[in-house]
């Protein structure tokens, strides 16, 4: 059965936008004016996972690209990567766990917790132009809060 998806952009709580940095990495930086067109548009799919009033499992694909954010162990550390998939098979309702994030809404802000690695979150650095990564701490230096902007299909 088809999976429900919507198109959106994400900004961290410091209003940094997410853009491509090479073929398999995202970075966060402040954009304005026409540069806003550089920000990546996600296709957010609603998938199998733990669901409650404030927690919704999603997969984050890059719109019109066969790339998904995924969480894997690299050198024994949970790591965020962009993974290439077969577009014939994705998105699907029951995604592999490494692609699944628990979208958690708290005070009008969103967190994206890895389903594969609980308590690890999509994170950005305070510094400009740094990679988006998977962080194991909340409320510290690194930013784990985001806002979502809907993009028309």
């Amino acid at each position: 059965a088809p999976v429900r998806s919507l198109n959106c952009t994400l900004r961290d709580s410091q209003q940094k936008s997410l853009v491509m940095s090479g073929p398999y990495e995202l970075k966060a930086l402040h954009l304005q004016g026409q540069d806003m067109e550089q920000q990546v548009v996600f296709s957010m799919s609603f998938v199998q996972g733990e669901e409650s009033n404030d927690k919704i499992p999603v997969a984050l694909g890059l719109k019109e690209k066969n790339l998904y954010l995924s969480c894997v162990l690299k050198d024994d550390k949970p790591t965020l990567q962009l993974e290439s998939v077969d577009p014939k098979n994705y998105p699907k309702k029951k995604m592999e766990k490494r692609f699944v994030f628990n979208k958690i809404e708290i005070n009008n802000k969103l967190e994206f917790e890895s389903a594969q690695f609980p308590n690890w979150y999509i994170s950005t650095s305070q510094a400009e132009n740094m990679p988006v990564f998977l962080g194991g701490t909340k409320g510290g230096q690194d930013i784990t809060d985001f806002t979502m902007q809907f993009v028309s299909s």
Partner: antibody
């Protein structure tokens, strides 16, 4: 409380079509997936397929050529048809609900029909 | 077809811990679910999404899933836990049950 009540013809001759219906009482029909599972006597469970309220289906590849699952949202019912039955299709057939709150797995089951 | 493999039976004395395994290729990258079925009854969900318990299921039931193996653990087993247990996961677009463990 959700209840799934199922019925259909019990005894069939080889090559006939098995037809079962499951009625859903209580709870929203459109927010879930609806599945059929079977269990041959003394054996394990086999997933047959699922449908959502819009009529979109997934089937077990081993049965796909013989199975049709349909839905009637006006009656909160869904149905299973299995064509060209043989003795190997002898089983208890269960209908079940797949719920988002349990990770889209089967959390309510019917009583089973042999 | 995708296969989930369970031991046919697991035997423990009351009060001991029972562990039932379910193995399948890269099972840890999928969500695993466990059902309990008693004779003449419909299956009952006891663990979902690897390690979560539905309301009404006792705390002695727990689950884990990593690598190629999901495990259902029943600690402090009771006579009423005697049943068949089935693991359940998905493969591409369809669902798969393990063969069951008595």
């Amino acid at each position: 409380q959700v209840q799934l009540q199922q019925w259909g013809a019990g005894l069939l001759k080889p090559s006939e079509t098995l037809s079962l219906t499951c009625a859903v009482y209580g709870g929203s029909f459109s927010d879930y997936y609806w599945s059929w599972i079977r269990q041959p006597p003394g054996k394990g469970l086999e997933w047959i397929g699922e449908i959502d309220h819009s009529g979109s289906t997934n089937y077990n590849p081993s049965l796909k050529s013989r199975v049709t699952i349909s839905v009637d949202t006006s009656k909160n019912q869904f149905s299973l048809k299995l064509s060209s039955v043989t003795a190997a299709d002898t089983a208890v057939y269960y209908c079940a609900r797949a719920s988002p709150s349990s990770g889209w797995t089967l959390d309510y089951w019917g009583q089973g029909t042999l | 077809q995708s296969v989930l493999t369970q031991p046919p039976s697991v035997s423990v004395s009351p009060g001991q811990t029972a562990s039932i395994t379910c193995s399948g290729d890269k099972l840890g990258d999928k969500f695993a679910f466990w059902y309990q079925q008693k004779p003449g009854q419909s299956p009952v969900l006891v663990i979902y999404l690897d390690n979560k318990r539905p309301s009404g299921i006792p705390e002695r039931f727990s689950g884990s899933n990593s690598g190629n193996t999901a495990t259902l653990t029943i600690s402090g087993t009771q006579a009423l836990d005697e049943a068949d247990y089935y693991c359940y996961a998905w493969a591409d677009t369809y669902e798969v049950f393990g063969g069951g463990t008595k």
